[in-house]
């Protein structure tokens, strides 16, 4: 068994979460991916991609911007403007049906406090960046990045949670559930 | 608790092949990418080499491509670098380093196994 | 290639007083940037990641600011064992992952 333990990240109201979700690109280039927050035994889906992915077209839900690179199996997730009301559980799941959801790596414990966060909003606030080409065994990616678009979604869904955090899984393929930014 | 040991280290000359392994535990290996940070002497860090948690992808710093190639064996723990047509720039301490779960950071780092390359 | 430039060089300090190390990139990596100790002989240690959060056991006297293309990282009060080498690291998106060229802190 492999315990999924937590990657803590604190912040300030204002600033900026960004993390890299990896997943299995032979299995789920193909699928969307979601961002989840875990409230009880029935988590909230905040976000998820479009179907078919798209390299590095951006979806956006309100402060949420998630970013799939399916060449690479890398969902990119930034988070702006945090407000105290974020702090909670996370984690990036493979969507593939309201009932039923893969996570891909440990929780992360998003920690909100008040208080300067001594950067100016204008700069966190900010999706806009311009990212390095990889160079990479993988394929090259297209084009770098492009404006993201709003996408209207329906109110969050619950989805079936295949670990609850600090519980122990069994894993009968360790890249399916996945903790490394780098990829599989 | 989260262990990394290299070993392989040594004295060779320019042109010469070199190979360094790296034991990890504590942690489940092939559910995490690997890396080479190589520190010359007196001089500051400089990433080297990553791979994937299964192998399938390997990055390399332009000053290294071409001539190593790393490499991980998931069922024994350990990740390697095989160093060829060395020169006297690689000269460094070579660290083995666990990439963190959700960000391209180093969270845990072995001691380091000295490479030298002179004539 | 992002380029990150720490300053300064070398800082001396009295034990007790406060540091502050800075370390600046070249394009905007938002939040992502991590900070590294290394005492002489030793192998580098995690002190903090995307720009704010202490790494497991890291004392509170050291913490990270910044975003963007401007960073910090202040120890309150330095304490003899917090004589080092600190470094910044770089992890926008892709590689290569750079460090900067490194601050020591001296003792005053």
């Known amino acids: 068994t492999t315990e999924l333990t937590e990657e803590k990240y604190e912040y300030k109201e204002g600033q900026t979460l960004e993390v890299k979700c990896d997943y299995a690109l032979e299995k789920y280039a193909n699928s969307r991916k979601a961002w989840q927050k875990m409230e009880g035994k029935m988590p909230k889906i905040l976000a998820k991609t479009e179907r078919p992915s798209e390299n590095s077209h951006p979806v956006q839900v309100g402060r949420i911007t998630l970013e799939d690179y399916p060449d690479h199996g890398l969902l990119q997730v930034r988070m702006t403007n945090l407000q105290v009301e974020d702090s909670g559980l996370y984690q990036c799941v493979i969507y593939q049906h309201p009932k039923e959801s893969h996570v891909l790596f440990n929780p992360i414990c998003l920690v909100v406090t008040k208080g300067s966060s001594g950067t100016p909003g204008s700069s966190e606030n900010s999706t806009q960046n311009v990212y390095r080409t990889p160079s990479t065994t993988a394929k090259a990616l297209g084009p770098r990045y492009t404006s993201p678009r709003t996408v209207t979604q329906a109110p969050p869904e619950s989805t079936v949670v295949v670990s609850t955090p600090g519980s122990e899984i069994n894993l009968t393929n360790v890249t399916d559930i996945i903790r490394v930014p780098v990829f599989n | 608790e989260v262990q990394v040991l290299e070993s392989g280290g040594g004295l060779v000359q320019p042109g010469e092949s070199l190979r360094l392994s790296c034991t990890a535990s504590g942690f489940t290996f092939n559910a995490y990418a690997m890396s080479w940070v190589r520190q010359a002497p007196g001089k500051g860090l400089e990433w080297v080499s990553t791979i994937s948690g299964s192998g399938s992808t390997t990055y390399y710093a332009d000053s290294v491509k071409g001539r190593f190639t790393i490499s991980r064996d998931n069922s024994k723990n350990t990740l390697d670098l095989q160093m060829n047509s060395l020169r006297a720039a690689d000269t460094a301490v070579y660290y083995c380093a666990k990439v963190a779960g959700s960000n391209f950071f180093f969270d845990h780092w072995g001691q380091g196994t000295l490479v030298t390359v002179s004539s | 290639e992002i380029v990150m430039t720490q300053s300064p060089a070398t800082l001396s300090v009295s034990p007790g007083e406060r540091a502050t190390l800075s370390c600046r990139a070249s394009q905007s990596i938002n939040s992502n940037l991590a900070w590294y100790q290394q005492k002489p002989g030793q192998a580098p240690r995690l002190l903090i990641y995307g720009a704010y959060t202490r790494a497991t056991g890291i004392p509170d006297r050291f913490s990270g600011s910044g975003s963007g293309t401007e960073f910090t990282l202040t120890i309150s009060s330095l304490q003899s064992e917090d004589f080092a080498v600190y470094y910044c690291?770089?992890?926008?998106?892709?590689?290569?992952?750079?460090f900067g060229l490194g601050t020591q802190v001296e003792i005053k």
């Open positions: 690291q770089e992890f926008i998106m892709w590689p290569p992952w750079t």
